[in-house]
């Protein structure tokens, strides 16, 4: 509950406000209750963090967040007698971290990371303006199913790009999702200042490309089933089929947000398949479909990344140009 | 075969604004930085801003901050120099160069003039 | 800024001799230097990065070597096509910056 009753007098500051880091970007927070409590006053602690972000009113005497240490980040902690957001708390005590020392200009940009198909991570940076062309680099990266940090050993460059990339496969745990990877890339010198990100695990996903199956014709209607990238359930998926007809030059894109196998002409009961009519097209011509997926936002934050085209297939005749 | 092509120089008063394109060819566009570089007769070969390869991070010299803006099109593989605030001493041929691995430029368009004169 | 100095600004040569061009830096650059050649009305051409390693397509008679604030651009033996201006540039630092230029000229 609310505790006993709330004195008027101003509680005394809590002591010993102390911060450390776990991992590679979990901050806490840890403190010691007021000296001189009120003894019929029980204990609340108001939080929050520089910004006046995130306020908070709780029992306990830690806090921790999860935030890229790119820069100086502080959590101010005052005691109370009650849950009350308009009770004065005591004096604000304030502790702060800073990122790890070094030249912001030699720090990597653009850290970021995509998750492949639910299989693998691949982060990619691009070397700060004030940084020695020759400078190695190491990621290392966290996971809450992982029992220590780990260092990223497939490193590669791509044009002015670095990156690297590790295996990160979906577990069974429901709440596996829920957590967000750890990032942080340094060089092996220990010259450039340190880069951080954080990368929940319903953003930034691509699916691998699906796999045409059939591909079949019912009056001038085509009928496209496919196969989803494993990993993913249809549902969770948005579609792009897209077909190209040779006479006429035809391109037609079909956004598809649903795409089930109900109807009669589709092979039925075959796992993980998806399903599409394209109306009005000539079977009496050669027509070539490919088809993209990405996730979709019942399942994921994010649904910005397509996959890449799945293998053409055709159907029909290529007429004889005369 | 790498290829640069620069364009959009011409005469303009001062205060006035004018904006450069560059379109490049022969190679992965995305992956890498693409700047502009001036020259002038009296104070030579001079760097004036740049854009990684996805545009998100931009650099400038000082000489032009605040009145320079770059961006970059990967669909169209161009990039465009917007300058505002023209003065007297922005009057320079401007290439537009592809970066190398790192800050040196391997790849040159042919040049723009831009001309600031009332 | 990074400052590099060049010398000398101008030289006159003839065809077949070595030319050698000195490149010196306002702090030790590593080995981050490029050289280019420039043509009249023409755009620079790359030649020579990390001090020493040749552009694709470069003649074998361009070499560099240095380190730190010495560098040196040889011609080992002068070609007809090769009378243009030479810069030098650090990229050690941002931002990256040029050699005032050498003139190289016909005896």
């Known amino acids: 509950g609310g505790g006993g009753a709330a004195p008027t007098e101003t509680q005394p500051p809590v002591t010993n406000l102390s911060v450390s880091v776990e991992n590679l970007c979990t901050v806490i927070w840890t403190w010691n209750p007021p000296e001189g409590a009120s003894s019929n006053c029980s204990l609340w602690y108001f939080s929050h963090f520089g910004d006046k972000q995130d306020k908070k009113i709780a029992p306990e005497t830690r806090r921790s967040i999860e935030v890229p240490l790119n820069e100086r980040i502080c959590l101010q902690v005052g005691s109370q007698c009650s849950t009350n957001e308009s009770e004065k708390p005591s004096i604000l005590v304030e502790k702060c971290i800073s990122p790890p020392e070094g030249d912001p200009e030699s720090a990597v940009t653009e850290l970021q990371c995509i998750w492949h198909n639910l299989s693998y991570m691949k982060c990619s940076w691009l070397p700060g303006r004030n940084t020695s062309p020759d400078t190695n680099y190491t990621l290392y990266y966290w996971h809450r199913s992982l029992e220590k940090i780990h260092q990223c050993e497939n490193i590669f460059r791509e044009g002015q790009y670095f990156g690297c990339s590790f295996d990160l496969t979906k577990v069974k745990d429901s709440s596996f999702e829920q957590h967000s990877v750890q990032i942080m890339v340094k060089d092996n010198a220990g010259k450039i200042k340190p880069s951080f990100n954080i990368v929940p695990l319903t953003s930034r996903v691509k699916p691998d490309p699906p796999h045409i199956k059939n591909l079949s014709f019912h009056n001038d209607d085509l009928y496209v089933q496919w196969e989803n990238p494993q990993n993913f359930i249809s549902r969770c998926l948005f579609y792009e089929v897209e077909v190209n007809n040779s006479q006429t030059e035809t391109h037609n894109v079909f956004y598809v947000q649903e795409a089930k196998c109900e109807n009669p002409e589709f092979e039925r009961n075959v796992e993980n398949t998806s399903c599409f009519m394209v109306p009005g097209v000539l079977p009496d011509t050669l027509n070539t479909v490919r088809i993209r997926v990405k996730t979709n936002k019942l399942c994921y934050e994010d649904d910005k990344l397509w996959s890449n085209w799945s293998q053409e297939m055709s159907i029909g005749k290529k007429r004889n140009s005369t | 075969e790498v290829q640069v092509l620069d364009s959009g120089g011409g005469l303009v008063q001062p205060g006035g604004s004018l904006r450069l394109s560059c379109t490049a060819s022969?190679?992965?566009?995305?992956?890498?930085?693409m700047s502009w570089v001036r020259q002038t007769p009296g104070r030579g070969l001079e760097w004036v801003s740049g854009?990684?390869?996805?545009?998100?991070?931009?650099y400038f010299a000082d000489s032009v901050k605040g009145r320079f803006t770059i961006s970059r099109d990967n669909s169209k593989n161009t990039v465009y120099l917007q300058m505002n605030s023209l003065r007297a001493e922005d009057t320079a041929v401007y290439y537009c160069?592809?970066?190398?691995?790192?800050?040196?430029?391997?790849?040159w368009g042919q040049g723009t003039l831009v001309i600031v004169s009332s | 800024d990074i400052q590099m100095t060049q010398s000398p600004s101008s030289l006159s040569a003839s065809v077949g001799d070595r030319v050698t061009i000195t490149c010196r830096a306002s702090q030790g650059i590593s080995s981050w230097l490029a050289w280019y050649q420039q043509k009249p009305e023409k755009a620079p051409k790359s030649l020579i990065y990390a001090a020493s390693s040749l552009q694709s397509g470069v003649p074998s008679r361009f070499s560099g070597s240095g380190s730190g604030t010495d560098f040196t651009l040889t011609i080992s033996s002068l070609q007809p096509e090769d009378f243009a201006t030479y810069y030098c540039q650090q990229y050690n630092s941002h931002p990256p910056t040029f050699g005032q230029g050498t003139k190289l000229e016909i005896k």
């Open positions: 160069a592809k970066e190398g691995d790192w800050i040196y430029f391997d790849s």
């Open positions: 854009i990684s390869g996805s545009g998100l991070s931009t």
């Open positions: 022969g190679f992965t566009f995305r992956l890498y930085t």
